[in-house]
């Protein structure tokens, strides 16, 4: 049966036993800046092109043991959430991966900047259709990272990022605080903000909307046919990247402002229990859970 | 995220190092009255001191970025400091990434075309 997260983003009139928009997002390229990925996993084979871009810091600790499946875990799962054959949102989207996070899931602002610059140069060398850039990472507020995101957005690229998993104001983190970036918080199957250990999803006025981000089934790098459940604002951002890819594939001329407006318009309103947020943040945090449009032009999204 | 917000720095630290009057032998002095600023991550454990992104003013060309980076290296060498240019940015933002001692920040902030300098910091999978 359909995983809860795919059901949640699917308008009721399209719900069936399975979620299957076969070519959703086929005109769009999604760039993923994350860990290395297992690109030939059955769920994503042929859908993800691993670029030769790699800019990661060394792993911490003298006795760190580099295990391939662990190194690939985060990125493989997210690639599956965006475009996986069976558990992905935009099953027609093609992806390109850049490695900016090491085997411990750690990267640098400078490495991310160089990755964003790589994307811009690729776009100039070989202009394609609409581009979505997924940044499932967060660091402290960074003027330079936000500035780079702004420049890329002004070049027509849609950037989607994780709000952060610090149960804190997203405005204190980057790229979540960049105004031009679509910043995504995480909710669960009960439309509650996601709790992650002692922390949880970030919130506040720098968040644009929420999306499923708890117990999300996706490709596991443990084996070529394995699936695993992961949680976080990265998973939530991957849903929105997939939805954005489907919207842009249906309407390639959409501007960033129009896309943002559509994402908000088609979101489920006032379903999140705001009591979870600090009192002073409740009015500032958008009560929106992302969903696909219940398009009257069915073929736009589901052909 | 969330368009329409003011650009808020939150806890973000901004250290403004005022420019001294003597130009330290620079051929091209920065425009009168402009102050390049230094930024670093407010979360101490995430800081990566020793690596800095030198961001140049918007219209700076690649050749000027390279020249500014070389000038920093030359001036640092005169003071007995080794520096390494790790990357020259162009396409999105003009500037360069440099590995150097924090002692050289004041010098770097006085270079021509410099808009601001940011200390590198960590980002994490979410």
């Amino acid at each position: 049966s359909i995983p809860w997260n795919l059901e949640r983003i699917t308008p009721p009139r399209y719900r069936a036993d399975e979620y299957q928009p076969p070519d959703g997002g086929s005109l769009v390229e999604v760039y993923l800046l994350d860990t290395s990925i297992q690109s030939d996993h059955r769920e994503i084979e042929g859908r993800v092109m691993v670029t030769d871009f790699e800019n990661v810091p060394e792993e911490d600790g003298t006795r760190f043991h580099r295990q391939a499946s662990k190194c690939d875990s985060h990125g493989t799962h997210l690639a599956g959430v965006v475009s996986g054959r069976d558990a992905g949102v935009a099953k027609g989207a093609s992806m390109r991966s850049l490695r900016v996070l090491n085997c411990q899931g750690k990267g640098t602002v400078s490495g991310t900047l160089i990755g964003l610059e790589f994307i811009r140069k690729s776009q100039l060398v070989q202009p394609v259709g609409p581009l979505v850039v997924l940044l499932p990472l967060a660091g402290g507020y960074s003027r330079v990272l936000n500035a780079a995101c702004q420049r890329l957005a002004r070049a027509g690229v849609v950037l989607v990022t994780a709000a952060g998993n610090f149960r804190d104001d997203a405005c204190l983190y980057s790229p979540a605080s960049a105004p031009e970036v679509i910043t995504v918080g995480a909710t669960n199957a009960q439309d509650q903000p996601v709790t992650l250990g002692t922390l949880g999803t970030n919130f506040g006025r720098c968040v644009d909307l929420f999306a499923p981000g708890e117990d999300i089934i996706g490709a596991s790098s443990d084996c070529s046919t394995c699936f695993v459940s992961q949680s976080g604002t990265s998973q939530a951002a991957a849903h929105v990247a997939g939805i954005a890819a489907m919207m842009l594939s249906a309407e390639p001329e959409l501007t960033l402002a129009e896309l943002r407006q559509r994402l908000i318009h088609f979101s489920a309103k006032d379903v999140i229990n705001e009591a979870w947020f600090p009192e002073d943040q409740r009015v500032l945090t958008p009560n929106l859970v992302a969903a696909l449009p219940p398009s009257t032009h069915e073929n736009l999204y589901f052909q | 995220g969330a368009m329409g917000q003011e650009d808020e720095d939150g806890d973000y630290e901004e250290l403004v190092l005022a420019l001294r009057s003597e130009e330290d032998g620079l051929a091209e002095a920065p425009e009168h009255g402009t102050t390049a600023t230094f930024h670093r991550c407010a979360k101490d454990p995430w800081r990566l001191p020793g690596t800095y992104v030198v961001v140049l003013k918007e219209e700076t060309h690649l050749s000027q970025s390279e020249r500014t980076a070389r000038r920093l290296q030359a001036q640092a060498a005169r003071r007995g400091y080794l520096t390494k240019i790790l990357h020259v940015f162009h396409g999105l933002l003009p500037g360069f990434l440099v590995k150097m001692s924090g002692d050289l920040l004041e010098l770097a902030l006085k270079l021509p075309h410099v808009d601001y300098i940011e200390e590198d910091s960590s980002v994490f999978a979410q």
């Epitope: 076969p22 297992q38 042929g46 993800v48 691993v50 054959r85 084996c223 070529s224 | -």
Partner: antibody
Framework: QVQLVQSGAEVKKPGASVKVSCKAS????????ISWVRQAPGQGLEWMGW????????NYAQKVQGRVTMTTDTSTSTVYMELRSLRSDDTAVYYC????????WGQGTTVTVSS | QSALTQPASVSGSPGQSITISCTGT?????????VSWYQQHPGKPPKLMIY???NRPSGISNRFSGSKSGNTASLTISGLQAEDEADYFC?????????FGGGTKLTVL
């Protein structure tokens, strides 16, 4: 263009081993693994297993597990399938195909097991 | 015994439409979006005609279409032509492997 080129026909005695090669070209090798499929004379298709061109991981069908070994040589973009302890019912055409999706196939290698 | 059940043979006249069924369980056909159909002419390797239930690879005629309902997938060939005479195999993911149907011989009368 995307191509999978296999090694030539083999005749083997029962109990022997056979090693079939499959050279891939024309695509990003790490984006797909290689599946091996066999077809006995006049019969249907049987999936034997898969190997990752990315990290060499394998996934073997239960029926041949323990007798089959798939390996990869990334320097030559070649994948190998070795089947040991051959029996007469292993007589078949052996195909390599791209990925689990099997969208591109090699020309096939006939393996005859006969005493 | 193949894991997926197909009719041994079907036939049709030129111009007609035919449908080949492929029945599995909810552990294969019913559980995944990844049902494929292959055409095989004698002495040749199989050729992918439909992937992921209903998608056609580039270069495949739109006379070929695929669908799925529950645990049964179907391949429909419309406007039957002489060159469509061949064996047709379905395949599906299972949790850890791949399974094929036993094959259907299509005869164009």
């Amino acid at each position: 263009q995307v191509q999978l080129v296999q090694s030539g026909a083999e005749v083997k005695k029962p109990g022997a081993s056979v090693k079939v090669s499959c050279k891939a070209s024309g695509y990003a090798l790490t984006s797909y693994g290689i599946s091996w499929v066999r077809q006995a004379p006049g019969q249907g298709l049987e999936w034997m297993g898969w190997i990752s061109a990315y990290n060499g991981n394998t996934n073997y069908a239960q029926k041949v597990q323990g007798r089959v070994t798939m390996t990869t040589d990334t320097s030559t973009s070649t994948v190998y399938m070795e089947l040991r302890s051959l029996r007469s019912d292993d007589t078949a055409v052996y195909y390599c195909a791209r990925g689990y999706g099997m969208d591109v196939w090699g020309q096939g290698t006939t393996v005859t097991v006969s005493s | 015994q193949s894991a997926l059940t197909q009719p041994a043979s079907v036939s049709g006249s030129p111009g007609q439409s035919i449908t080949i069924s492929c029945t599995g369980t909810n552990s294969d056909v019913g559980g995944y979006n990844s049902v494929s159909w292959y055409q095989q002419h004698p002495g040749k390797p199989p050729k992918l005609m439909i992937y992921e239930v209903s998608n056609r690879p580039s270069g495949i005629s739109n006379r070929f279409s695929g669908s799925k309902s529950g645990n049964t997938a179907s391949l429909t060939i419309s406007g039957l032509q002489a060159e469509d005479e061949a064996d047709y195999f379905c395949s599906s993911y299972t949790s850890t492997s791949m399974v094929f149907g036993g094959g259907t011989k299509l005869t164009v009368l």
